[in-house]
């Protein structure tokens, strides 16, 4: 009964793990669509935004076959870490504007933390290699003026959207080749 | 340059109003949140209440929630705080302040209310 | 009673280095940045530090702001006569919805 001591023990299925990080990321796409909705009904601000501190799109979901899991992983991890980061700042430095999008944007920002943390032992489970420590990255710009911050948000918004989006396809094409 | 001019402070006597303005130049107002602090004479800062770039959002202090109203005018670059029943403790200097986010980077010069009978 | 606690009155002699203290809770310091102003007598306030340890142009390095948890402080090294003024701590508070302030404190240039 049980296996002899000193074995290693069994590691949960993968396609299970795999599964509840889908969920996470499905949950905390629907939490950025509603707030993007929120945060365009309360500041609306016509065409594209970009930020430069902003990690670029992994790739189009087509793209996705290509791809292997370690590196998706490690990508979407990286590429979620930077987002944090933004919305940390998007939390501590805006005024009064933005300050009605709360508790939501801290409710974001839990989740967020929460799914990198369900990456992190994904990418452990699967025994992928762990990167080394990120470097410290550079303090982000402050705004230069409150609507110069009402953009920074769509864009941090928007493109954590398109991230999420992308992640969630990738994951569950990738699923099928676990 | 950034410019805010403050103006229609003066002696009044308490339960009446009282309307100050605030002239915006050298900048884009409609791109910045505004806000008013005051100062007692011989006292410390005291945030008084703030308003979005837009006009939408607007917060105030305990002490004067219901009684001043913050409100602007970006066809025209002016901040506004109407002040109603007013009280001897808002005897003090009030100044407008421009933010570009959580913090105060321009100020105008002050203008003094007195509340007294 | 102000919601962020800054020592009253603080001083130095030219040339020496003086710290302010600002403390508060987590709901300003600990989940905002903090900002500092200095106001010279007679004047409107000025900024002087913000989003915790930056400077705008214009204020010269001798000045400098720190944060850890629910405390800042800032200090002011190779204290010069004019630094002579009241300065204030500042952040935004989650709780109140509203910016607050330290009760200021007064420097005093010594000699």
């Known amino acids: 009964p049980g296996p002899p001591p000193g074995s290693p023990r069994a590691s949960p299925d993968p396609r299970a793990e795999l599964d509840s990080t889908v969920l996470l990321t499905r949950s905390l796409l629907e939490d950025t669509r509603q707030l993007t909705i929120q945060l365009k009904d309360k500041f609306p601000a016509d065409g594209d935004h970009n930020l430069d501190s902003l990690p670029t799109l992994a790739m189009s979901a087509g793209a996705l076959g290509a791809l292997q899991l370690p590196s998706v992983l490690t990508r979407l991890r990286a590429d979620l870490l930077s987002y944090l980061r933004h919305v940390q700042w998007l939390r501590r430095a805006m005024g009064s504007s933005l300050k009605t999008l709360e508790p939501e944007l801290g409710t974001l920002q839990t989740r967020l933390d929460r799914l990198l943390r369900r990456l992190q032992l994904l990418m452990s489970r699967l025994a992928l290699p762990q990167l080394p420590p990120d470097p410290p990255a550079p303090p982000l710009a402050p705004p230069s003026s409150t609507w110069g911050g009402i953009r920074a948000a769509h864009a941090i918004l928007g493109g954590l959207h398109l991230t999420l989006d992308w992640a969630v396809r990738g994951l569950l094409l990738l699923k099928t080749r676990l | 340059q950034v410019q805010l001019v403050e103006s229609g402070g003066g002696v009044v006597q308490p339960g009446r109003s009282l309307r100050l303005s605030c002239a915006a130049s050298?900048?884009?107002?409609?791109?910045?949140?505004m806000h008013w602090v005051r100062q007692a004479p011989g006292k410390g800062l005291e945030w008084v209440a703030v308003?979005?770039?837009?006009?939408?959002?607007?917060f105030y202090a305990d002490s004067v929630k219901g009684r001043f109203t913050i409100s602007r005018d970006n066809s025209k670059n002016t901040l506004y705080l109407q002040m109603n029943s007013l009280r001897a403790e808002d005897t003090a200097v009030y100044y407008c302040?421009?933010?570009?986010?959580?913090?105060?980077?321009?100020w105008g010069q002050g203008t003094l209310v007195t509340v007294s009978s | 009673q102000s919601v962020l606690t800054q020592p009253p009155s603080a001083s130095g002699t030219p040339g020496q280095r003086v710290t302010i203290s600002c403390s508060g809770s987590?709901?300003?310091?600990?989940?905002?940045?903090v900002n500092w102003y200095q106001q010279l007598p007679g004047t409107a306030p000025k900024l002087l530090i913000y989003?915790?340890?930056l400077r705008p142009s214009g204020v010269p390095d001798r000045f400098s702001g720190s944060k850890s948890g629910t405390s800042a402080s800032l200090a002011i090294s190779g204290l010069r006569s004019e630094d002579e003024a009241d300065y204030y701590c500042?952040?935004?508070?989650?709780?109140?919805?509203?910016?607050?302030f330290g009760g200021g404190t007064k420097l005093t240039v010594l000699g």
């Open positions: 302040a421009r933010t570009p986010g959580s913090h105060f980077d321009y």
């Open positions: 308003i979005s770039y837009s006009g939408s959002v607007k």
């Open positions: 050298g900048f884009t107002f409609s791109h910045y949140d």
């Open positions: 989003y915790d340890d």
């Open positions: 500042s952040a935004w508070d989650d709780s109140l919805s509203g910016v607050v």
């Open positions: 987590s709901s300003n310091i600990g989940s905002n940045y």
